[in-house]
């Protein structure tokens, strides 16, 4: 099924060569004697059989219906029929954009990370033998490249590479010149790979508390989707019934990273909770980052410099 037209809904631009190739072509060669027919229906017209006399712009081959070129009135449904095999297409021919070298409906967008490999290759396998020359345009300005048969860009992407790249193939058929345009919208973005996760705020935090009261220690981090954030405290986590890890909260940042926070709730604070390390760690494939909290009795606040306190 080499280069057959498999998608049932096709939009093309007026004035360009175009073809429909059915997807049982190899089968058609095997049964040369079988009757093969192409039909068109549009609006009030029902199943009109196509033949070379239908229009000087239409050419019929074994597997292919060619338009030289396709025009607005070619819009409609097309059928290929051979024995009990039928293939149907819905063709929509749209107006060419007179103010640009391409039509926006016919754009393929690609997003490329800066410094990553980026390529544009101007190829058209079906019309290859008929193509005289091919030009590559960036934002409708012609690029001067060495190869005028298959112009190619292969490089590591830079932000300046962003833009609309149009491959224009020029070809002759029956003494007339035609062109076919293929346009790529290339957007260059910052490296989307993983960040080194980081815990927000000071690495050591003294928290002033009162015995018998409750406290919530909030640990926040900027991390990747697969990174984890957890609390470590005491000899064995979970040995103190008054200490609870709350459910982790995550919000996605506009850059696609995550802002996560995990609260450690200590209820009915006792002497055993004072002056011990409550460690919060963020772990990723790239390493870990830890910050510590120490509970200090409010009465002892005067002994510690003010800048190390967290409320």
């Amino acid at each position: 099924a080499e280069s057959c037209t498999s998608r049932p809904h096709i939009t093309v631009v007026e004035g360009e060569p175009f073809y429909l190739k059915h997807c049982s072509c190899s089968l058609a060669h095997e049964i040369e004697t079988t009757t093969k027919s192409w039909y068109k229906s549009s609006g009030s017209q029902e199943h009109v059989e196509l033949n070379p006399r239908s229009s000087s712009r239409i050419a019929l081959h074994d597997c292919v219906l060619e338009f030289w070129p396709v025009e607005l009135n070619d819009t409609g449904s097309y059928f290929f029929q051979m024995k009990n095999y039928t293939q149907k297409w819905k063709l929509n021919v749209i107006r060419r954009n007179k103010h640009s070298c391409f039509t926006e409906r016919q754009v393929t967008s690609k997003i490329v990370e800066v410094k990553k490999f980026f390529q544009i290759t101007c190829e058209n396998s079906y019309y290859q033998t008929l193509v005289n020359s091919t030009s590559l345009y960036k934002n409708c300005k012609k690029l001067l490249l060495e190869n005028n048969k298959n112009p190619t860009i292969k490089k590591n992407a830079e932000f300046e590479d962003q833009g609309y790249y149009s491959c224009v193939h020029f070809l002759h058929h029956n003494g007339k010149l035609f062109n076919i345009t293929k346009t790529f919208n290339i957007t260059i973005v910052e490296d989307r790979s993983n960040i080194v996760p980081v815990l927000l705020g000071p690495k050591l935090n003294h928290v002033a508390v009162e015995l018998g009261k409750n406290v919530r220690l909030n640990c926040s981090a900027l991390l990747n989707e697969e990174d984890v954030i957890y609390w470590m405290f005491g000899e064995e986590n979970g040995s103190d019934p008054n200490i609870h890890e709350e459910k982790e909260m995550r919000i996605m940042t506009p850059e696609g990273k995550w802002h996560a926070s995990k609260v450690l709730r200590i209820e009915n604070i006792g002497e055993s909770n004072l002056n011990v390390l409550y460690n919060c760690t963020v772990a990723s494939t790239g390493g870990t980052d830890t910050k510590s909290f120490i509970l200090v009795r409010k009465a002892d606040m005067a002994d510690i410099p003010g800048h190390v306190f967290t409320r």
Epitope: S3, S6, H9, E104, R105, S109, K110, I111, N185
Partner: antibody
Framework: QVQLVQSGAEVKKPGASVKVSCKAS????????MHWVRQAPGQGLEWMGT????????YYAQKFQGRVTMTRDTSISTAYMELSRLRSDDTAVYYC??????????????WGQGTTVTVSS | EIVLTQSPGTLSLSPGERATLSCRAS??????????MHWYQQKPGQAPRLLIY???NLETGIPDRFSGSGSGTDFTLTISRLEPEDFAVYYC?????????FGQGTKLEIK
Amino acid sequence: QVQLVQSGAEVKKPGASVKVSCKASGYTFTSNWMHWVRQAPGQGLEWMGTIDPSDSYTYYAQKFQGRVTMTRDTSISTAYMELSRLRSDDTAVYYCTTSGDYDADRYFDVWGQGTTVTVSS
Amino acid sequence: EIVLTQSPGTLSLSPGERATLSCRASKSVSTSGDSYMHWYQQKPGQAPRLLIYLASNLETGIPDRFSGSGSGTDFTLTISRLEPEDFAVYYCQQSRELPLSFGQGTKLEIK
């Protein structure tokens, strides 16, 4: 006619990787983009990323960046999706599906039958 | 990233009634007269099925009781007269830009 046939169900342990294949037939493999969409039990559809088989261009949803790899073998018209560092919430049905390459044509008219991936210790 | 929000989450109707499902995009998905919004139907244990492409075009083989409308950020899928087989989950999807995205779905259930 156009068909996508996916590999069979997989059961994996957390931290492991899974590679799902999708064999295309009935059309020119390099002319359509291949996408991967997953659906966790009782949840909605989640687009994971895409590959253009003509030049191996890939684009992944940010959520899967760094964990997913999409590849293709044009000689056998097959696309692959590998997801690494599996977690229990990766348990889902994974679908391959095709679209045209123009932005306007990136809708999914042909789907694979789905591959169930279960992540459990 | 374009976020699609579908409403309602669940719609309870009877066969024969008219269903109106909504999909709102966080930014416009329309350009040069085309709207890059598509609709799917999914039944339990099955892959999704394309219903409408480019906001209003009916996919081949889909009954004409299904129709799509809208432009810019607001889109609607309408089922004119519900048949028993129409009760399923419906998703909208945009292709205006990468990453592609789906709405969270609307469950259409029998009242």
